[in-house]
């Protein structure tokens, strides 16, 4: 037996991080996103839960809604009506899936200083929102959409087809919520509040995933979710638009699907209002390499929405799937005809293009061996976007302004030189026409949020600088973080290495690889974090590495689409390549290398452990996918095609974790899953376990009863990280 090793950070008054610090969230940071209500006004919820109004120009601020009013209904969120007469207060938050939740809503009349009585809202509500002007309300209750002209009015029921687990109006079903829309809603007001567009999802023919929820009762209850796995029947989707001022006159009008899309299975992917009578819909073939953007206009004479063929714009990928993780959405110009959109250029890098008439005639606005990530705002004279261009680091985000009024357009990096060491990863929040904006910097130093003038980019004030966190970290020994690249053959892999305090290159350290590796993901980011792996480096002296292999995002389509139709191959290969390179660096103890990951990372870590290379001593898979046939259709098929003989069934079968069960014999494997995982079903781990048992391979396992994909309840999370820590320390012969 090898003697146990204890890592002791040398002579320093600072203390190491403890696991308790991490589990208690002691070193969590704050961000500040203004809730914009005009060009120069915003709301923000204060530390003590008052809702405070701010006017940037007059510098006035006052409480518009007191914490006592919030507390009177136990409100945790709020929304001001655009006419500023009412506020909805949200309470009884009850989480459903990743984005969805139900809640109770109360309407507070700011003018009268009292809650609106009469025609009170039903409960629980699945979604509620104000119209963009005035104080109309749209809400979804029991899968149907309702409208209120004013908060105290009787409701008007727009849809009647809603039925639990069958038909969803105005809210997505499970698969659309998780894999397509990434929202809890599927309804959109027109800019003037006249029309309401919504989606109807018909899940009647979708197979059901059923799992037990144990609760406290004598009998478990069964959770049933219509969940299309790869190759299964998908939701049938229809888009409607209703005139909310006079909904009875015509009733909801269906928006036609483009012919080239409707000819086979398809998805609705997003809706963007262009003007009060023009709407843009995006559709996607089930084989997700063809996307169609369709611009539709209201025809008063027909009482219908017309989507002419010459207003259909096709986006197609010949090397993989359309878009990044999702197909990008258009940012329309003031003319309500032309728009800016991010898609791959001829070199396979995602860049901003300007489309005036056809995609073929698109004008490329940005270019280079980097990628445009997101278009924040298009105004009369400026376009604001984020990219990873600066200094060639894919894991950074800076905000740029292109002056589109100028010819040729001029580009300026707004954030590159603001706080160069502290801030290399930004997002932004703009007022309506970008007169002002907030920058939120996520790192690599302490996060900081600042307010800026939209014309001059001048910093007006610091909104949040995390001073308390800075103070509390003064006596903590944080690890050193490096972001570098390594080369192998013609490939370049970016990695992040977290090195223990007083790291000494001449010594040998255990290595833990943290992997996610899913298509279009990114792990190597210049962001601040104090989490479990920070603790492992700080206290336990473990070197941590994260590597972005092929299939990860923002480095061009050649790198991204390498994994197309063959998931589970290059993602794993590139982690192994990186480990070999790390060993060559000389400070890694080859006998003590582990890998861990969650979700897609659990899949990759499992396959890496079963690679037969002997590189890993042990590893952990939390909530892993074990076969792409078990996962959602929209996700699996985007990257793998269909699990049919004439398509890609063969690779579906040979990319499973179960197929490699024999190869786990020489590693210590810890398999963990929540039994109430609605996303990556417990079935995945159950099948791995069955295959390992059948192969007579010993392994460790832990399940978390009634926990979902996040295993996020306080007690479970504490148990999970404590358990994984013990497993790792045992693997690395580190004493407790």
């Amino acid at each position: 037996l090898r003697p146990s090793r204890v890592y002791k950070p040398e002579g320093n008054t600072k203390r190491a991080l403890t696991l308790k610090d991490i589990l208690n969230g002691t070193f969590s940071y704050k961000t500040y996103f203004p809730n914009w209500i005009s060009e120069q006004e915003y709301l923000h919820q204060s530390e003590d839960d008052n809702i405070v109004f701010y006017n940037i120009e007059t510098r006035e601020s006052y409480i518009i809604l007191s914490n006592s009013t919030m507390k009177s209904v136990n409100a945790t969120d709020y929304g001001l009506s655009p006419d500023r007469q009412f506020v909805y207060l949200e309470s009884d938050y009850s989480k459903l899936w990743r984005y969805s939740y139900t809640a109770t809503y109360y309407i507070y009349d700011l003018q009268n200083g009292e809650f609106v009585r009469g025609y009170e809202l039903p409960r629980p509500i699945q979604y509620l929102c104000w119209s963009p002007v005035g104080s109309k309300l749209a809400y979804v209750y029991q899968n149907n959409i309702y409208l209120k002209q004013r908060p105290g009015d009787p409701p008007f029921q727009i849809t009647y087809t809603g039925r639990e687990n069958r038909i969803f109006n105005g809210i997505p079903d499970w698969v659309y919520e998780e894999e397509m829309l990434a929202t809890k809603y599927a309804l959109w007001w027109s800019p003037d509040g006249k029309f309401l567009a919504y989606v109807e999802f018909n899940d009647s023919d979708i197979p059901i995933i059923a799992y037990s929820y144990y609760g406290d009762g004598q009998y478990p209850r069964t959770i049933n979710i219509p969940y299309p796995k790869a190759g299964a029947k998908n939701p049938v989707v229809r888009v409607f638009i209703v005139d909310t001022t006079y909904p009875h006159h015509v009733g909801p009008m269906e928006v036609p699907v483009p012919e080239m899309i409707a000819s086979s299975d398809y998805y609705f992917s997003w809706l963007t209002w262009v003007s009060s009578e023009r709407v843009c819909l995006q559709w996607l073939k089930r084989v997700q390499n063809v996307s169609v953007l369709s611009i539709c206009d209201f025809r008063e004479d027909w009482h219908a929405w017309e989507c002419p063929k010459n207003q259909e714009h096709v986006e197609e990928s010949r090397t993989g799937w359309a878009g990044g993780f999702f197909v990008s959405t258009p940012a329309f110009s003031q003319d309500a005809t032309s728009y800016y959109k991010i898609f791959s250029d001829k070199d396979g890098y995602k860049h901003i293009h300007y489309i005036k008439d056809t995609v073929e005639n698109a004008i490329q606005i940005t270019s280079g061996k980097w990628e445009a990530i997101y278009i924040f705002r298009v105004t009369q004279d400026s376009l604001f976007y984020s990219s990873n261009e600066f200094e060639g680091y894919p894991g950074r985000r800076n905000i740029y302004r292109i002056s589109i009024g100028n010819s040729p357009p001029s580009k300026k990096c707004v954030t590159c030189h603001l706080r160069k060491e502290r801030c290399q990863y930004y997002t932004a929040s703009f007022s309506y026409k970008a007169k002002y904006y907030a920058l939120v910097c996520y790192g690599p130093g302490l996060p900081i949020s600042t307010l800026h003038d939209g014309r001059t980019d001048q910093e007006i004030q610091v909104l949040e600088e995390n001073k308390e966190l800075e103070n509390s970290l003064r006596n903590i020994q944080l690890p050193k973080v490096e972001i570098k690249k390594l080369k192998d053959g013609g490939l370049t892999f970016w990695y992040k290495m977290i090195l223990p305090p007083q790291f000494d290159r001449s010594k040998k350290y255990p290595l833990l690889i943290q992997v996610y590796g899913g298509p279009c993901s990114q792990s190597v980011k210049s962001v601040f974090a104090v989490n479990w792996i920070t603790y492992l480096a700080s206290k336990e002296g473990i070197v941590i590495a994260l590597v972005d292999g092929r299939g990860t995002a923002f480095q061009g389509d050649k790198f991204l689409h390498a994994v197309y139709r063959k998931l589970g191959v290059y993602e794993v290969e590139d982690q192994l390549t990186a480990v070999r390179k790390f060993i060559e660096m000389g400070f890694i103890d080859e006998e003590r290398i582990a890998i861990w990951g969650w979700s897609y990372g659990g899949y990759v870590s499992s396959l890496a452990l079963a690679s037969g290379t002997g590189l890993f001593k042990c590893g952990i898979a939390v909530a892993p996918v074990s076969s792409w046939e078990y996962y959602a259709s929209i996700y699996s098929e985007r990257f793998m095609g269909l699990p049919t003989k004439d398509d890609n069934l063969e690779h579906y079968k040979n990319s499973t974790v179960m197929a490699r069960a024999e190869y786990f014999r020489n590693v210590d494997y810890l398999l963990i899953h929540g039994t109430a995982d609605d996303n990556v079903h417990f079935q995945n781990s159950a099948q791995i376990a069955k295959a390992l048992v059948n192969a007579q391979v010993d392994f460790q396992a832990m399940w978390y009863s009634d926990q979902n994909h996040g295993i996020s309840s306080g007690r479970s999370q504490n148990h999970l990280y404590t358990h994984m820590t013990h497993f790792l320390k045992q693997c690395f012969s580190l004493s407790d």
């Epitope: 005035g134 109309k136 002209q149 009787p154 008007f156 029921q157 001022t245 909904p247 009875h248 006159h249």
Partner: antibody, heavy 118, light 108 residues
């Protein structure tokens, strides 16, 4: 309290014109569809016309199309009904009503009587 | 247009009794888009029910509506003296909106 007050009714000869007004108070007038509904003496109710909040769209019963014009002035919180080419069968009490979603009516004004007779 | 026929034309009942008023449509009223009103002599109509069964604000719970398709009912569970009036049904499921001819509930 919501109040609707009609005025402008009276006796008019066939072929003549009349303009009805409805003054609204106690609610955000500019947010609502508004309608006129009439009731001939001793008879039932008949919807006449409706107008959307912006005034941009108007709707009429076939029996009055081309003769009546509904309009509104949101700055004055007032609804109007211009009645031209009046006929004996237009004789009725005319009510203005807050119109929910182009559906039901609530509340109604007290009504104004229009008598078309020679 | 949809024609609404109310029956009976007149209903003679005593206070405390149950009143059942019927409204039949010439064709199906989509999504139960039907309202009921009460009108007393010399007064404007007053909304009782919308959406076939939803009570308007301030309306006592002795008033209830039911039905769908072509057959709708207004029920007054126990007649109070102030309930004696004319009752109208109105459909708003298709254009133009139309009313029934009314049912008069009188004291027996």
């Amino acid at each position: 309290e919501v109040q609707l007050l009609e005025s402008g009714g009276g006796l008019v000869q066939p072929g003549g014109s009349l303009r009805l007004s409805c003054a609204a108070s106690g609610f955000t007038f500019k947010s609502y569809v508004m309608s006129w509904v009439r009731q001939a003496p001793g008879k039932g109710l008949e919807w006449v016309s409706a107008i959307v909040p912006s005034g941009g769209d108007t709707y009429y019963a076939d029996s009055v199309k081309g003769r009546f014009t509904i309009s509104r002035d949101n700055s004055k919180n007032t609804l109007y009904l211009q009645m031209n080419s009046l006929r004996a069968e237009d004789t009725a009490v005319y009510y203005c009503a807050k119109d929910y979603y182009g559906g039901w009516f609530d509340p109604w004004g007290q009504g104004t009587l229009v008598t078309v007779s020679s | 247009e949809i024609v609404l026929t109310q029956s009976p034309g007149t209903l003679s009942l005593s206070p405390g009794e149950r009143a059942t008023l019927s409204c039949r449509a010439s064709q199906s009223v989509s999504s139960s888009y039907l309202a009921w009103y009460q009108q007393k002599p010399g007064q404007a109509p007053r909304l009782l029910i919308y959406g076939a069964s939803s009570r308007a604000t301030g309306i006592p719970d002795r008033f209830s509506g039911s039905g769908s398709g072509t057959d709708f009912t207004l029920t007054i569970s126990r007649l109070e003296p102030e309930d004696f009036a004319v009752y109208y049904c109105q459909q708003y499921g298709s254009s133009p909106r139309t009313f029934g001819q009314g049912t008069k509930v009188e004291i027996k």
